[in-house]
């Protein structure tokens, strides 16, 4: 460590010999007093009136209170101007001033970089009274200095509402380089250049930077801080760090991993959550993203059927949530389902394929040749039909649903009947006379109710009319249903 000291003629001579703790410019003597966490302005008590603090601002007094004698200007003695020391060392420095005893109340405060140091710092003030003057030495000590202690320290003394300010004592705490910016982990595209930044400060300056990639020095010649390293591209993951060197030694940054973006791993654990006749709800667990965020996913669906042409249906969906409802599927069919996801680099491989089945659907066609006629003697309506030509996917026929609507003089009533799958005829009781009965029939499977047949109408006359001619739905391709009364 180095100290700088200036000695000048004293404006107001004190004592023939040095005072304890003052005017010492050798460095060792400046590293003594202990230090607490806060700073405290020195409170100085008059040697003539113990217990009573001096008050007032620094002034340049010219005249005594009697107004008879001209006094030289008051000023702090020059002392060490610059103290350079290493981090964690102790330091002590002081201000000294000789004050004529005519001034009763004075205070000395310590300031750093323009701010008063308040609190419980180790500031100690000693008094050395004489007949005409009192020598005051204000000492400031810091133990285990840190970089934050760097700065310009001054003493201020108030006398007669004026201020006397000392020359600054500049404390420079030197240590190993301190990083203000370190390289950061990144995910980069293969064989594409990118930059890393490293910045470190002293004191002491300059700070030189060396870059290290996978334990090999990138620049054998140092670069002044801050340094930007252009990495010309990577084909595989690499670890980078930077070394900051100054006259005190070397500090190494954290090592950062630079990953190479790649296509994602395939999704795993594709699961079936719900199946209906025409849709399947699936979920999956995304694979590793390849150090690049997922953009979207693709659900691939193949029908497992020797007679199918093996074509693949592709449904694109967002990457999250990891769930998709596949629609527009055939009922009672087997499917093989796989999922692939993509990031900016490309598509993953397809997940392991899973098998899933849709449930049976409702019939897609209505019963044929629906015939309706009135059996007046029994006061009911006979209905006959032919079993529909249902596809296998519709599942097993479990019965029929018959809708009959009775309309007469402004009233309308719909009734539903269920009949078993073995039937191809049914009888329903006449509900209203002098009314129109409209009959429709739908086939029913476990998958649901199919479409209703075209309506067949029959007129139910008042009691006494007899007409056994049926009403019926035409065979496919015939004209509209005929209403026979």
């Amino acid at each position: 460590a180095i100290t700088e000291a200036r000695e000048e003629a004293k404006p107001y001579p004190l004592f023939p010999g040095p005072l304890p703790g003052s005017l010492q410019t050798d460095h060792t003597s400046l590293l003594s007093l202990p230090h607490t966490s806060g700073y405290q302005p020195a409170l100085m008590f008059s040697p003539t009136q113990p217990g009573r603090p001096y008050t007032g601002n620094v002034a340049i007094p010219r005249v005594t209170s009697a107004g008879s004698k001209l006094l030289p200007p008051l000023a702090f003695k020059h002392t060490v101007g610059h103290i350079i020391l290493s981090e964690h060392k102790d330091v002590k420095f002081n201000c000294s001033i000789s004050v004529p005893n005519i001034y009763q109340d004075t205070t000395i405060s310590w300031w750093k970089d323009g701010k008063e140091l308040l609190g419980a710092h180790h500031a100690i003030t000693q008094f050395y009274p004489d007949d005409e003057v009192t020598a005051i030495i204000a000492s400031f000590s810091i133990t285990s200095v840190q970089r934050s202690d760097n700065g310009s320290y001054i003493c201020k003394m108030k006398i007669n509402n004026e201020e006397i300010v000392s020359d600054p004592i500049y404390i420079e705490v030197q240590g190993l380089p301190h990083f203000t910016k370190q390289p950061e982990s990144m995910n980069v595209t293969r064989n594409t250049a990118f930059n890393l930044t490293c910045q470190a400060v002293g004191p002491p300056e300059p700070v030189n930077i060396f870059w290290v990639q996978n334990s090999s020095r990138v620049n054998e010649q140092p670069e002044k801080s801050p340094s930007v390293l252009t990495v010309p591209g990577l084909t595989e993951m690499a670890v980078f760090s930077c070394e900051a060197h100054n006259d005190k030694g070397l500090t190494v940054s954290k090592g950062v991993q630079i990953n190479i973006k790649a296509i994602p791993s395939p999704p795993t654990e594709v699961s079936i959550h719900n199946s209906t006749a025409h849709s399947i709800l699936i979920s999956w667990v995304p694979g590793f993203d390849g150090y690049s965020p997922f953009r979207n996913c693709s659900v691939q669906v193949k029908e497992v059927d020797p007679l199918s042409n093996g074509s693949v249906m592709i449904f694109n969906t967002s990457a999250s949530p990891h769930m998709y409802q596949i629609k527009q599927l055939q009922a009672l069919a087997n499917y093989s389902i796989g999922v692939s996801c993509m990031n900016e680099i490309g598509w993953s491989a397809v997940s392991p394929w899973i098998l899933a089945s849709t449930t049976e659907g409702a019939p897609s066609v209505a019963p044929l040749n629906v015939t309706v006629f009135l059996n007046e003697s029994r006061d009911n309506v006979d209905i006959r039909w032919m079993k529909p030509l249902t596809k296998r996917q519709a599942g097993e026929l479990v019965g029929y649903r018959i809708s009959h609507v009775w309309q007469s003089a402004g009233i309308s009533k719909e009734l539903l009947e269920e009949v078993g799958q073995n039937n191809s005829r049914a009888q329903i009781s006449v509900q209203v006379h002098n009314a129109t009965c409209t009959v429709r029939i739908a086939a029913v499977t476990k998958g649901g109710v199919g479409p209703f047949s075209d309506p067949v109408k029959i007129f139910i006359p008042a009691h006494g009319w007899v007409d056994h001619a049926p009403s019926s739905t035409p065979a496919p391709g015939n004209a509209d249903p005929v209403l026979i009364i």
């Epitope: 090999s216 620049n219 054998e220 010649q221």
Partner: antibody
């Protein structure tokens, strides 16, 4: 533009010394290291080592420790290669090359032929 | 020291041909650089850091590889490409060169 200009060919007797110069221009001399590369007649390239132009510290590869000295005069942006106690097998073209990050020799001098013959 | 082995050592080819020169390292390296040298001339940087074209180098030159295996490819040989090519590794000191590949006109 970046240029490295080397001194001319030298014919020396065995046991003598030679000093080859390499003058750099077109860039800040102390920002890049300076390497030396040897090429014996009809042979490939051999990296001899380099000198840190910022600190002046030379680094030699194992085969070039002892009789070979790298030095600098930064005031004239010049690097030097001195070979003492010359032997016949030192006959070669000696190249200086600017040495940048990742050990890239991005600019080369034109080469200096040193012939050692009695 | 890391040994670099170039293959082939000699290569005869015609203008317009596509040629590939291989450089194999005795252990894994970080990057490979490639230089071109014509008779009586200094080497010239061609490709640095495995795959980056040096300034002014035509795009018919390309480089690839990682670990211990690297290649220099010239997609369509031009008359001015007939020269000797050297690979040089970065990743382990001392830096070493391959023994060279001499590309001759067939």
């Amino acid at each position: 533009q970046v240029q490295l200009v080397q001194s001319g060919s030298e014919l020396k007797k065995p046991g003598a010394s030679v000093k080859v110069s390499c003058k750099a221009s077109g860039y800040i001399f102390t920002s890049y290291g300076l390497s030396w590369v040897r090429q014996a007649p009809g042979q490939g390239l051999e990296w001899m080592g380099w000198i840190n132009t910022y600190s002046g510290v030379p680094t030699y590869t194992d085969d070039f420790k002892g009789r070979f000295v790298f030095s600098l005069d930064t005031s004239v942006s010049t690097a030097y290669l001195q070979i003492s106690s010359l032997k016949a097998e030192d006959t070669a073209v000696y190249y200086c090359a600017r040495y940048t990050n990742y050990g890239v020799f991005d600019y080369w001098g034109q080469g200096t032929l040193v012939t050692v013959s009695s | 020291d890391i040994q670099l082995t170039q293959s082939p050592s000699f290569l005869s080819a015609s203008v317009g041909d596509r040629v590939t020169i291989t450089c194999r390292a005795s252990s894994s390296v970080g990057y490979m650089h490639w230089y071109q040298q014509k008779p009586g001339k200094a080497p010239k940087l061609l490709i640095y850091a495995t795959s980056n074209l040096a300034q002014g180098v035509p795009s018919r030159f390309s480089g690839s590889g990682s670990g211990t295996g690297f290649t220099l490819t010239i997609s369509s040989l031009q008359p001015e490409d007939f020269a000797t090519y050297y690979c040089q590794q970065w990743g382990s000191l001392p830096f070493t060169f391959g023994q060279g590949t001499k590309l001759e006109i067939k």
